[in-house]
């Protein structure tokens, strides 16, 4: 059988090879499609309800004003010339539908280093056959699954038009110390060959590179945190991170009701103010980051070291912030 | 929403003439064939005529051939019916229906419209 | 020309029944077949096209059937608004031919 592809909606003939070019002609086509069960046979003659979708013409031909999916499928004629001798022709018909240009919607305007980011979603309308969605980084093709590429993919079909909706979601993890502005593009490729490519204008996202996290710092002085009844505590909570963050300060795991300071006076200890110390900084852009945790103690007088199992009340007693 | 609204019947004696309209809106109108079905008082539906998207084409039952004359303007979405040598037998409600080939039969209707044949 | 041979041409049955309309084609018209329904006074309604498939907006108790040239409309529980006059068509070859119709009535 030969090969046609047609595009939807755009007129086709079929010429019935061996047919004499006027009537009176002894032909007959007989079409085996979507629209038939079986085989449906078409004569010069006919003329009806399948006149919308093909008719004979009076050169014998097969005329289908406008082809759609259902036509897809098995066209044969039958003739006989004038010595009656029989010729017969044999089609294939595939059709097709380019959709319109490939759209990136969603895309994000910018991308962090190191992790997953959703790029954007690159839709397909309106092709037939589906067809297939590729993503391209900076000019070369992304392989899903490789180096923190990942593509959600999706195919819809338009309940009367019978056409192609395509999704395609890309997710990268960009490299640190990478491209600052890489050059992200999507192309539908037809599922019929010898259609060219369609890509999408560009889009192209800053990748922001975020700065790792230096440690905070909580400086006791005295050094050990051990200090005799009546004495003064001074924790310091050191942050490099520029701006300053934000410092709260914890007790034995629970947040102290003071305003944000970086440093913490306990002036005058008691017994109540025996426990664990531990700063918060909270950073805009980071969440909050909370240091290690110091033990205060009270030394009796005579004592080498804190004294064992000496743990305060709840009470905070008198607390100066610096 | 699609619409059909057909128009002109009335009472005519036998032999003369009627022309029948029939308003289309909501679809596109040149996309499809359109056809005229009829159905006396009291009986069943009976094909009447049909036209091609294009206009190009007309088909007729044996029973209104050269009597009738079905045509459309897609310029003013609009089709049409004309009835010459009336006989007692046309009388019917006369509807007007989209399609009419095989891509989808007769999908949607008008109210239909009375046509009388009497002296 | 196609005849359409619509049976029974009546017939009466009571809410929840299940009802069988059938039309035998003279010839074979494939799958290009509907079925209408019809009140008095009121146009046709689309209910069935090509054969099995229901059009858009009718309930799911009326279903369409095919073997060979007999095209079958069934209605699994009559309703009340389902007494009314019921047509096949056939749109494979002109002339374009209805059955006869089959009026259910309320028993």
């Known amino acids: 059988a030969q090969n046609i592809t047609a595009r939807i909606g755009e007129p086709l003939v079929l010429k019935c090879k061996g047919a004499p070019k006027k009537p009176p002609q002894r032909l007959e086509w007989k079409l085996n499609t979507g629209r038939t069960e079986a085989w449906k046979v078409l004569s010069p003659q006919g003329g009806g309800p399948w006149d919308s979708v093909a008719r004979v013409l009076p050169n014998g031909s097969l005329f289908l004003p406008a082809v759609g999916i259902q036509d897809e499928g098995i066209f044969r004629c039958q003739a006989m010339n004038r010595n009656g001798k029989e010729t017969k022709s044999n089609y294939r018909v595939r059709v097709y539908q380019i959709p319109g240009k490939p759209e990136i919607v969603d895309s994000a305007s910018e991308l962090t280093a190191g992790v997953p980011n959703k790029v954007g979603t690159c839709v397909s309308e309106g092709s037939y056959p589906a067809g297939t969605l590729s993503w391209h980084l900076d000019g070369k093709p992304l392989v899903p699954n490789e180096k923190g590429v990942s593509v959600k993919e999706q195919t819809r079909r338009h309940p009367e038009t019978g056409l192609f909706t395509l999704q395609s979601e890309l997710m990268v993890t960009p490299a640190r110390g990478g491209d600052p502005r890489p050059t992200f593009s999507c192309s539908f490729s037809p599922g019929l060959p010898r259609h060219r490519a369609l890509r999408t204008a560009p889009i192209q996202p800053r990748v922001w590179e975020p700065v790792p996290l230096e440690e905070v710092q909580l400086v006791v002085e005295p050094e050990g945190g051990a200090v005799a009844p009546g004495g003064t505590v001074t924790l310091t909570c050191e942050v490099p991170a520029q701006p300053s963050p934000q410092i709260h300060w914890m007790k034995d795991g629970v947040p102290l009701p003071l305003p944000p300071s970086p440093v913490l006076i306990l002036p005058e200890i008691g017994p109540q103010d025996q426990g664990t110390y531990s700063c918060v900084a909270t950073h805009s852009s980071h969440g909050p980051q909370e240091s290690r945790a110091v033990s205060i103690s009270i030394i009796e007088p005579g004592e080498e070291g804190p004294t064992a199992g000496s743990v305060g009340g709840s009470g905070l007693g008198t607390l100066a912030l610096a | 929403e699609v619409q059909l609204v057909e128009s002109g019947g009335g009472l005519v004696q036998p032999g003369g003439s009627l022309r029948l309209s029939c308003a289309a809106s909501?679809?596109?109108?040149?996309?499809?064939?359109m056809t005229w079905v009829r159905q006396a008082p009291g009986k069943g539906l009976e094909w009447v005529a049909s036209?091609?998207?294009?206009?190009?084409?007309?088909y007729y039952p044996d029973s209104v051939k050269d009597r009738f004359t079905i045509s459309r303007d897609n310029a003013k979405n609009s089709l049409y019916l004309q009835m010459n040598s009336l006989r007692a037998e046309d009388t019917a409600v006369y509807y007007c229906?989209?399609?009419?080939?095989?891509?989808?039969?007769?999908?949607?209707w008008g109210q239909g419209t009375l046509v009388t044949v009497s002296s | 020309d196609i005849q359409m041979t619509q049976s029974p041409s009546s017939l009466s049955a009571s809410v929840g029944d299940r009802v069988t309309i059938t039309c035998r084609a003279s010839?074979?018209?494939?799958?290009?077949v509907n079925w209408f329904q019809q009140k008095p006074g009121k146009a046709p309604r689309r209910l069935i096209y090509?054969?099995?498939n229901l059009a858009d907006g009718v309930p799911s108790r009326f279903s369409g059937s095919r073997s060979g040239t007999d095209f079958t409309l069934t209605i699994s529980s009559l309703q009340p608004e389902d007494f009314a006059t019921y047509y096949c068509?056939?749109?494979?070859?002109?002339?374009?031919?209805f059955g006869g119709g089959t009026k259910v009535e309320i028993k």
């Open positions: 229906a989209r399609g009419g080939d095989i891509r989808e039969g007769l999908r949607y």
């Open positions: 036209i091609d998207n294009s206009g190009d084409n007309t």
């Open positions: 090509r054969a099995t």
């Open positions: 909501g679809f596109t109108f040149n996309n499809y064939w």
């Open positions: 010839q074979d018209v494939g799958i290009y």
């Open positions: 068509l056939e749109f494979d070859e002109h002339p374009l031919t």
